[in-house]
């Protein structure tokens, strides 16, 4: 209430002979500062002086003398809010009632306070969670109610003896409300720790021992086993007999079942600590273990492997990868339950030994077609041989091999025959699908791998196919070889260069583009009739009657073909000249008289010239002389002349009579 | 019966490029399954494998020359020529050609040239 | 690249001797090892191969054995002729390699 002081402080202060102690307070006076302390052990209060009596250890006045035997205690207070105090050293016998006598200008107060001082250091005090599981972190609490700033102490943590790994935190507490010193230690119990003995030590600066509190620890924790196995390598053959003992080496609380896992899963009827196996089998391979369960839980024993030794079973191939393709490369794995691994493998490919192959893996790094077919393999181990298994395929796939081009016709093929070719491989893989052809024609196709050429062209050479599956493979082109007539036979005259004249020597060249078969023969004609038969006709001194319409003829065993008609045009001056006269070489006079130059010659003739019997040119100069009216004086010989570009040509002389009219007789 | 011979330079300088060719009879490379390996032995050394060619014209190299190793076949003139460029006296050696079957792999060599001794030295 | 290693490098045996020559293969090679007999101033001739297989004209003396990484070439009773220099290869992986060979004297 109001009439009240209000002090703060620790209701008890505990500390050992010779150690300090330390009291933090605080007060709030009722009325101003405070003006007189004592601080007495032990008060009790006499009613006849109406005051206290007892032990002063401290006294402070007005006059603010304090006694000498009280430096042992010091008011570390002030006069309105603070009444801290500290005593160093402090003896047993400072053990019971403190008294803070507080007076003021008008009111006065006693607060008590208790001290436990013990002959020897207190011990601390651990302080455990109620239950303690293994591997689950707990916090371990060493609690000390002390502290005091002229006393320096620590507090350790051992566990059998022996200082503890983990960090402990430590703090401290001097406060109105407490004075204590705690250390905190985490800690993560494991089930070996069970039944051990935890201790926290107090020491002082030095590290001295002062006291001690000890805990054992009781960590809960699932059974903890040993598996023996006889044979101690749990290594057998099939048909041995196995034995497995399951012993607890730990179980807190005590365990309640027992059951046998294989390869975890649990065994049915097996629920003592021994297993036994007899005749075992290899599906009796694999790892065990014990399992015995408490109230934490379940605890699992090591696992046992047990290996049940045997022959190797039959094989299978495994082929990387099938189809291949030729040139690639190929992996074949051969499988097969054995125990211990086999050793040696023996491979076969379609029943056949492959030599130097005795890995568990055959690498071929280049497939070949004849690599097609079955892959077998035997393994081995130290108990046995295996048994050949039933093999796996291998698929070499790879364009179509060897192909021809074949001609079905009888040879030799002929101008215009029709022609069949197919075209033929020895082996494909997968099947051939199509074929092509080179070069490419308006051809037709009748059945696969079958080409026709009707009228074979005389310049079908070479024919080359393909055989297709997933590739093309093309064969060597062939010939076909055609043969035909001699074409494109001409005449070619190879001399004179110029025109041919007459007397000149001439060469004609019977000339053809090709021929097959190149064996010929030649025949020269004029007008039906055979000349010769080379290659070319020779003139030695061509005549205007050799001029005319020659062909030439190129045979050889397929047929013969001409050439086309060649005119032969020889260049000569006027020849065989002769006058003729109309209506005849004799005229009457008063007629009409005609005399023509006739000619042969070639070119025609350019230009006539008559002359008279006495060799005088006459001014005429075409092919004919019209005499009109022919008169008697115009009687006698005549001869013409012809001229071309090649020369000149004379006539014989032609007498021309002109007789008189019966009407001149009949005057005369 | 089949037979293969080595011809080439009896002496190169070095820098020089070596080229050496080996003849063979009673084999053809085109036939599949087949190959022919460069394989060289300096004086009082081992063997050391070079190259190899195989019945498609296929070919390998050892890892430490391959820059400098050149391998083909002439099948029409049944012949197999290895180049080495960039010669150095540490390859004086005696090269050999043989012949290797090719089954489910690499076989053994069978058949080998009598060898022809290559000095390189200026 | 597989590593042979042989060893002996060289030994001195009497005639009548039986002679045992190791090589190793620095990673398992199956049974692709192959032995071969070189004389002085001849070509290698292959003596074994794929580990045991003996050829037809090579004297039945000569034998192999082994598998994986560990081969032996064994001479059952040593003959004069028989003095050279022995190397193993291995076809099992390109590039080829051959051992250092092992060399052989007659005492």
């Known amino acids: 209430d109001s009439s009240k002081w209000v002090f703060e402080h620790p209701e008890t202060l505990y500390a050992w002979e010779g150690a300090c102690v330390w009291i933090p307070c605080t007060y709030r006076a009722l009325d101003g500062d405070l003006e007189s302390f004592i601080l007495f052990h032990n008060p009790e209060y006499n009613k006849n002086t109406s005051k206290f009596d007892g032990t002063r250890l401290y006294e402070s006045t007005k006059d603010g003398k304090v006694p000498s035997e009280q430096k042992r205690v010091q008011f570390l207070g002030d006069k309105n809010k603070n009444c801290t105090l500290s005593i160093h050293p402090v003896h047993l016998n400072d053990s019971g009632q403190l008294g803070l006598r507080m007076e003021s200008k008008t009111e006065k107060w006693m607060e008590r306070i208790h001290l436990n001082v013990s002959e020897r250091p207190f011990p601390p005090h651990i302080q455990l969670p109620p239950e303690i599981q293994e591997s689950q972190e707990v916090t371990l609490t060493c609690l000390l109610n002390f502290s005091c700033y002229g006393y320096p102490i620590q507090l350790q943590w051992l566990l059998e003896g022996v200082p503890m790994r983990q960090a402990a935190v430590t703090s401290t507490s001097l406060t109105i409300k407490s004075v204590f010193t705690r250390s905190e230690l985490k800690f993560s119990p494991q089930w070996s720790h069970h039944g051990k003995i935890v201790t926290c030590q107090l020491q002082d600066a030095d590290g001295k021992f002062l006291s001690n509190d000890t805990v054992q620890l009781n960590v809960k924790h699932t059974p903890k086993l040993e598996i023996k196995v006889t044979p101690s390598d749990a290594i057998v053959r099939e048909g041995d007999s196995v034995t497995m003992t399951c012993e607890v080496s730990s179980s807190n609380p005590e365990y309640t079942t027992v059951s046998w896992l294989k390869d975890g899963t649990s065994l049915k009827k097996q629920n003592t600590f021994t297993l036994n196996l007899r005749e075992v089998t290899k599906d009796q391979s694999g790892k065990y273990c014990c399992q015995v369960s408490n109230d934490v839980g379940p605890g699992r024993s090591e696992e046992v492997f047990l290996q049940v030794q045997y022959a190797p079973e039959p094989s299978t191939v495994q082929i990387l990868h099938s189809p291949a393709v030729e040139g690639s490369q190929v992996e074949f794995l051969c499988m097969s339950l054995a125990n211990p691994l086999p050793t040696n493998y023996t491979w076969y490919h379609n029943g056949k030994e492959m030599q130097g192959r005795t890995e568990e893996k055959v690498h071929i790094p280049k497939i070949l077609p004849w690599h097609a077919g079955t892959y077998s393999c035997v393994a081995e181990n130290i108990l046995g041989t295996g048994q050949r298994g039933p093999g796996a395929e291998l698929d070499v796939q790879y364009p179509p091999k060897k192909v021809t081009t074949v001609i079905q016709n009888p040879m030799p093929i002929r101008e215009g025959d029709t022609v069949t070719l197919s075209c033929n491989y020895n082996s494909s893989n997968p099947s051939v699908t199509r074929y092509e052809w080179k070069p490419h024609g308006a051809w037709e196709e009748p059945s696969l791998g079958v080409l026709k050429i009707q009228n074979v062209g005389w310049d079908n050479t070479t024919i080359a196919c393909a055989a297709c599956n997933s590739w093309c493979s093309w064969a060597s082109p062939v010939a076909l070889n055609v043969q035909y007539a001699p074409r494109d036979v001409r005449v070619r005259k190879i001399k004179p260069l110029s025109e041919i004249h007459s007397g000149n020597s001439v060469s004609l060249q019977c000339d053809f583009s090709s021929s097959h078969p190149k064996e010929v023969q030649f025949f020269w004609e004029k007008n039906g009739r055979l000349l010769g038969k080379e290659s070319q006709l020779n003139f030695d001194s061509i005549s205007p009657e050799d001029a005319g319409s020659y062909s030439c003829w190129v045979n050889n065993s397929i047929g013969q073909t001409a050439s086309k008609a060649w005119t032969l045009e020889v260049l000569y001056a006027p020849r065989r000249l002769r006058v003729s006269m109309s209506p005849g070489d004799q005229v009457m006079e008063g007629k009409s008289a005609t005399l023509t130059c006739e000619s042969d010659a070639n070119p025609p003739v350019s230009h006539y010239t008559w002359f008279d019997w006495n060799n005088q040119s006459l001014p005429y100069h075409s092919q004919k002389l019209r005499l009109e009216p022919v008169k008697v004086q115009h009687s006698g010989a005549y001869w013409c002349q012809g001229t071309n570009s090649v020369g000149k040509g004379r006539s014989p002389l032609s007498t021309l009579t002109v007789y008189y009219s019966p009407e001149t007789i009949g005057r005369r | 019966q089949v037979t293969l011979r080595e011809s080439g330079p009896a002496l190169v300088k070095p820098t020089q490029t070596l080229t050496l060719t080996c003849t063979f009879s009673?084999?053809?490379?085109?036939?599949?399954?087949?190959?022919v390996s460069w394989i060289r032995q300096p004086p009082g050394k081992a063997l050391e494998w070079l190259a190899l060619i195989d019945w498609d014209g296929d070919n390998y190299y050892s890892t430490s020359l391959k820059t400098r190793l050149t391998i083909s076949k002439d099948t029409s003139k049944n012949q197999v020529v290895l180049t080495m460029a960039s010669m150095d006296p540490v390859d004086t050696a005696t090269y050999y050609c043989?012949?290797?079957?090719?089954?489910?792999?690499?076989?053994?060599?069978?058949?080998w040239g009598q060898g022809t001794m290559v000095t390189v030295s200026s | 690249e597989i590593v042979l290693t042989q060893t002996p490098s060289s030994l001195s045996a009497s005639l009548g001797d039986r002679v045992t020559i190791s090589c190793r293969a620095s990673q398992s090679i199956g049974s692709l090892l192959h032995w071969y007999q070189q004389k002085p101033d001849q070509s290698p001739k292959l003596l074994i191969k794929f580990a045991s297989q003996s050829l037809s004209g090579v004297p039945s003396r000569f034998s192999g054995s082994g598998s994986g990484t560990d081969f032996t070439l064994t001479i059952n009773s040593l003959e004069a002729e028989d003095a050279a220099t022995y190397y193993c290869?291995?076809?099992?992986?390109?590039?080829?390699?051959f051992g250092p060979g092992t060399k052989v004297d007659i005492n």
């Open positions: 290869h291995q076809s099992r992986s390109l590039p080829f390699t």
């Open positions: 043989a012949r290797m079957g090719y089954t489910y792999g690499y076989d053994a060599f069978d058949i």
């Open positions: 009673g084999i053809s490379l085109t036939t599949s399954g087949m190959c």
